[in-house]
């Protein structure tokens, strides 16, 4: 059993490594956004036993603006972007209580712009453990309709070792 | 068509530092969320960390505070710097560029490199 895509959450990106069952995963404030004090990042598969479908737990997190870096012009794309500060540790307690967080999640002094470029062909290299899947692109509509500001891309099988509407990590596409 | 070539391994001493480059050619690399992974012989890979494209980044708790990761994105390039190197550093390093479901949610791809090699020895 595992989960579907965890949701979209304003202003934070996450980078899921495991779609199993309790897998924790992190989500983090964009650069110039911080997390808010008393709000949660984390987010945990689990099973719901009465439908015994696998969903992810929803975060708290609020992303606001660091007012440390309003007054800060965003840097042209040409620079170089990094971050040094991680975020503050976090606990996925039954009780629900998290420790506050006042620093960011990434003390990102520049913010890179990219246009994204829809309907481009990507075309796998071999992977280090699997090796070759070939896949396509395409944009998807997962998201809610205030999120569909950006155009996403989304994993397809396509002759390959791995059946239609399985994506990496065991994440299978059922709902 | 995407396609990612790692550099910058090598032998290094304990406490050293590298910095490992990840090319990206092909529609899409500049707005990708890309991660470093490593992998050694016999054993699982392991995630690194993450830049997505904000600039903001995320890492593994062994490597918080060592690893650093920029882009730059002019030269379609991802960067792993690499500092206070440890002999269980040792790996090959690869970088991936994810594939995004949602909104701001992203995971590991079919898009590899070929990977560099980290050795850290005395």
């Known amino acids: 059993i595992t989960c579907p895509p965890p949701m979209s959450v304003e202003h934070a990106d996450i980078w899921v490594k495991s779609y199993s069952l309790y897998s924790r995963e992190r989500y983090i404030c964009n650069s110039g956004f911080k997390r808010k004090a008393g709000t949660s990042s984390l987010t945990e598969c689990v099973l719901n036993k009465a439908t015994n479908v696998a969903h992810w737990t929803t975060p708290s997190l609020k992303c606001i603006r660091d007012p440390a870096l309003v007054h800060q012009r965003p840097a042209p794309p040409s620079t170089v972007t990094t971050a040094g500060v991680t975020p503050q540790p976090e606990s996925l307690s039954p009780s629900g209580k998290e420790p506050a967080a006042s620093s960011p999640s990434s003390n990102n002094t520049a913010a890179t712009t990219a246009a994204i470029v829809p309907g481009s062909q990507l075309m796998p290299s071999k992977s280090p453990s699997t090796g070759t899947t070939e896949i396509s692109s395409h944009e998807s509509s997962h998201g809610t309709p205030s999120q569909t500001t950006a155009k996403n891309w989304e994993l397809t099988a396509s002759a390959s070792h791995q059946p239609p509407g399985v994506y990496p990590q065991g994440h299978s596409d059922t709902t | 068509e995407v396609q990612l070539v790692e550099s910058g391994g090598g032998l290094v001493q304990p406490g050293g530092s590298l910095r490992l480059s990840c090319v990206g050619s092909g529609d899409g690399f500049s707005i990708s969320a890309v991660a470093w992974y490593r992998q050694t012989p016999g054993k699982q890979r392991e995630w690194v960390g993450v830049?997505?494209?904000?600039?903001?980044?995320d890492y593994a708790d062994s490597v918080k505070g060592r690893f650093t990761i920029s882009r730059d994105n002019a030269k379609n390039t991802v960067y792993l710097q690499m500092n206070s190197l440890k002999p269980e550093d040792t790996a090959v390093y690869y970088c991936?560029?994810?594939?995004?479901?949602?909104?701001?949610?992203?995971?590991?791809?079919?898009?590899w490199g070929q990977g560099t090699q980290v050795t850290v020895s005395s």
């Open positions: 991936n560029a994810g594939v995004t479901t949602n909104r701001g949610v992203h995971h590991e791809s079919n898009y």
């Open positions: 830049i997505f494209s904000s600039g903001s980044t």
